[in-house]
């Protein structure tokens, strides 16, 4: 028998984290995002579910909707109408895909203090929202859009083409929801509430993915989803705009697609209202290296939307795909003509540009060997954005203000020196014209949310500082986290290392690599987390490392586009390089190195295990992609092109996990997948398993019946992490 190797944190009254702590969410943190309703007013749902109104300037606060009203319909969410007369209450939340869900909606009249009766909303509703002015309601029911001029009015049906799994109006189909829009909706009100723009997705010709949902019945149900895999027929999209003042007078008006886009397969990528009669649409060729931003105007006399060519702005990538993960959206100036947008500069770094007439004449606003990440708000005199510029750490996020009123514009970092050790990764939430804003810091210390004056940047108050969490962590031995970079040849890789408490460089520790590695992702971030890997370091004495290899984001296009058309090569290579460097550091036990990942990370971990290097003793792949032909068209083709002979079929074929089945012979492999995974279909793991069986390679596997890509139901999640913990401890010869 091997002597058991038990890691015991030495002489300390503090206790180590337990797996139970993680599974119970004992150390989860809170953030505070104001629900802005004006320049200086916001709503927030309190701990006890009252909806509270706050006025920053008068310091006034009161309950506008009591928890008893919420409870009366089991509401879990709410939305105040802009005229403040009504609130919708959302209940019976029923999750569909990543963003989509259906729910039951009740309208509460704040004036009368009662629910609106008569012409009640149908159920379940797929999406519902107020107009930006007044209290018009738009909602999607059974794939059709309806309009109510007032909550108590009868509904007006705007679309009639909706049909389950065939035609979607105002809501995206599966692939658009997951890979393009990242929303549950595909409709947008004009700023004054006159027009409602929406997308119609026609999935009639899309192949169906079908899988069993076992449930409790005698026979399983079959789930059918129109899901275009790489190279398959895609949804056909059309954008319409309806005048909601007289919806019966003139029907929905179709917005024309730019001719350079319409000449072959294309995608709609986003819609931005510029003014009450000007709209901006973004389109993308199916080969996603050309994006066109088209500005369209309403012609009242013709009841038509016109998109002149001089208002078509083309963004093209010559080294990869357009945009980052998504093509960025424009932030328009007050003049409703010029806008600010993030795209790659001549050096391949994503930066803010100001476009007044043509993209060719764009004025670069930010520059440097770092990237602008997001434009939060453009006002008359300021532009607020986030970037990873500060101190050269790609995994940080700070908020900056550019005074665009000044000439030349001056730049100020709003967050860099606020709580320098605690806070290095920020996001923000601005009131309408940025008179006030909230900063939400995610770490590396305990998250904290604060309220600020938009003119002076002065902190007004702390909204949430996670005091309870701070107190409960006082007696916990947390691991030490380091973020550093390693160099190999001409390449620099940032890594995060999570070191066990009382880490001693002279000792040897098992190493677990956690990998995601997907294009335009980032794992090495300066954020706070107490999760499974924190536990593994704290209690089990395992060193954890996360490495951002080529293909990951925010370090320039040269690094990002390195993986273009050849997924599965450099992502794996760079993990292997990093492991070799970690071994050189002297505190890693070479005999006990493992790798694990989920989704794209499952793909990379599988390929790393099958790399034939002998570096890994064991590894885990959860819900891995096994072939890019099995994954969604929009995603696969963005990075790989088409799986056709005259395009990139060869690399589609030789980048599969199945092609490397033989190489799993000398590693312990645990393959895990949910059978109801709508995203990375169970098919992926079924094919890996088949290939391993055919190659007579032993492996371990676990499926989770009726679980989706997140394997997130309480019982399944507990089982999953317990199972993976046992597997790892066995691999590393750590006793239970």
């Amino acid at each position: 028998l091997r002597p058991s190797r038990v890691y015991k944190p030495e002489g300390n009254t503090k206790r180590a984290l337990t797996l139970k702590d993680i599974l119970n969410g004992t150390f989860s943190y809170k953030t505070y995002f104001p629900n802005w309703i004006s320049e200086q007013e916001y709503l927030h749902q309190s701990e006890d579910d009252n909806i509270v109104f706050y006025n920053i300037e008068t310091r006034e606060s009161y309950i506008i909707l009591s928890n008893s009203t919420m409870k009366s319909v089991n509401a879990t969410d709410y939305g105040l109408s802009p005229d403040r007369q009504f609130v919708y209450l959302e209940s019976d939340y029923s999750k569909l895909w990543r963003y989509s869900y259906t729910a039951t909606y009740y309208i509460y009249d704040l004036q009368n203090g009662e629910f609106v009766r008569g012409y009640e909303l149908p159920r379940p509703i797929q999406y519902l929202c107020w107009s930006p002015v007044g209290s018009k309601l738009a909602y999607v029911y059974q794939n059709n859009i309806y309009l109510k001029q007032r909550p108590g009015d009868p509904p007006f049906q705007i679309t009639y083409t909706g049909r389950e799994n065939r035609i979607f109006n105002g809501i995206p189909d599966w692939v658009y929801e997951e890979e393009m829009l990242a929303t549950k909706y595909a409709l947008w009100w004009s700023p004054d509430g006159k027009f409602l723009a929406y997308v119609e997705f026609n999935d009639s010709d899309i192949p169906i993915i079908a899988y069993s949902y076992y449930g409790d019945g005698q026979y399983p149900r079959t789930i059918n989803i129109p899901y275009p895999k790489a190279g398959a027929k895609n949804p056909v999209v059309r954008v319409f705009i309806v005048d909601t003042t007289y919806p019966h007078h003139v029907g929905p008006m179709e917005v024309p697609v730019p001719e350079m886009i319409a000449s072959s397969d294309y995608y709609f990528s986003w819609l931005t209202w510029v003014s009450s009669e000007r709209v901006c649409l973004q389109w993308l060729k199916r080969v996603q290296n050309v994006s066109v931003l088209s500005i369209c105007d309403f012609r009242e006399d013709w009841h038509a939307w016109e998109c002149p060519k001089n208002q078509e702005h083309v963004e093209e990538s010559r080294t990869g795909w357009a945009g980052g993960f998504f093509v960025s959206t424009p932030a328009f100036s007050q003049d409703a003509t010029s806008y600010y947008k993030i795209f790659s500069d001549k050096d391949g770094y994503k930066h803010i540009h100001y476009i007044k007439d043509t993209v060719e004449n764009a004025i670069q606003i930010t520059s440097g060997k770092w990237e602008a990440i997001y434009i939060f708000r453009v006002t008359q005199d300021s532009l607020f954005y986030s970037s990873n510029e500060f101190e050269g750490y790609p995994g940080r996020r700070n908020i900056y203000r550019i005074s665009i009123g000044n000439s030349p514009p001056s730049k100020k970092c709003v967050t860099c020196h606020l709580r320098k050790e605690r806070c290095q990764y920020y996001t923000a939430s601005f009131s309408y014209k940025a008179k006030y804003y909230a900063l939400v810091c995610y770490g590396p210390g305990l998250p904290i949310s604060t309220l600020h004056d938009g003119r002076t940047d002065q902190e007004i108050q702390v909204l949430e500082e996670n005091k309870e969490l701070e107190n409960s962590l006082r007696n916990i031995q947390l691991p030490k986290v380091e973020i550093k970079k390693l160099k190999d040849g001409g390449l620099t890789f940032w890594y995060k290392m999570i070191l066990p408490p009382q880490f001693d460089r002279s000792k040897k520790y098992p190493l677990l690599i956690q990998v995601y590695g997907g294009p335009c992702s980032q794992s090495v971030k300066s954020v706070f987390a107490v999760n499974w890997i924190t536990y593994l370091a704290s209690k089990e004495g395992i060193v954890i490392a996360l490495v951002d290899g080529r293909g990951t984001a925010f370090q320039g296009d040269k690094f990002l586009h390195a993986v273009y058309r050849k997924l599965g090569v450099y992502e794996v290579e760079d993990q292997l390089t990093a492991v070799r460097k970690f071994i050189e550091m002297g505190f890693i036990d070479e005999e006990r190195i493992a790798i694990w990942g989920w989704s794209y990370g499952g793909y990379v971990s599988s390929l790393a295990l099958a790399s034939g290097t002998g570096l890994f003793k064991c590894g885990i792949a959860v819900a891995p992609v096994s072939s890019w032909e099995y994954y969604a068209s929009i995603y696969s083709e963005r990075f790989m092109g088409l799986p056709t002979k005259d395009d990139n079929l060869e690399h589609y074929k030789n980048s599969t996990v199945m092609a490397r089945a033989e190489y799993f012979r000398n590693v312990d492999y645990l393959l895990i997948h949910g059978t109801a995974d709508d995203n990375v279909h169970f098919q992926n793991s079924a094919q890996i398993a088949k290939a391993l069986v055919n190659a007579q390679v032993d492996f371990q596997a676990m499926w989770y019946s009726d679980q989706n890509h997140g394997i997130s139901s309480g019982r399944s999640q507990n089982h999953l992490y317990t199972h993976m913990t046992h597997f790892l401890k066995q691999c590393f010869s750590l006793s239970d």
Partner: antibody, heavy 116, light 112 residues
Amino acid sequence: QVQLVQSGAEVKKPGSSVKVSCKASGGTFSPYTISWVRQAPGQGLEWMGGIVPNVGVATYAQKFQGRVTITADKSTSTAYMELSSLRSEDTAVYYCARDAADRDYWGQGTTVTVSS
Amino acid sequence: DIVMTQSPLSLPVTPGEPASISCRSSQSLLHSNGYNYLDWYLQKPGQSPQLLIYLGSNRASGVPDRFSGSGSGTDFTLKISRVEAEDVGVYYCQQRNNKNRTFGQGTKVEIK
């Protein structure tokens, strides 16, 4: 490439009606204005009216109001112009055009001759 | 209806020389969105008209850069920097600011 193909030449008697068709191919039809323009022999261009097929509401020049009817069939991507109570001065080449602020496509023209 | 008046109605030109046509509208063609809804067309002998300039000053695709449009409100000009033999034909301005579109009478450009 967008193409507009019009119906063939017509010879009509005064007082009768003529219906000219314009079939679009190779591009989107619905969101664009389809205009009808005529040109009498040796004369300039005269705008008669138009329609946005997707909306279906036609607009007519005052001069032709009550005599012209413009329609569109989205399913066949075809627009129609019907002119009634024909007189000899309606003898002209009738063009359909798809316009979109910045680019236009014209049919080859249909010659309508009105003579007794 | 908006009345469009072109001048001159006939323009004899010498190849290589510049040429200019004026178009005046009876009402402003400047829309609240900032665009001037005025287009210029050329109809070559025996052909359908073709768009040259849209929204007052923007060249349509495929139109040589010797053609330029300028003006705002009620006064517009089409310029040809160096006339070529293939530029002969009748030039029309058309307003699209009003529900009822109207053409100018046309300017016949011919080689001297």
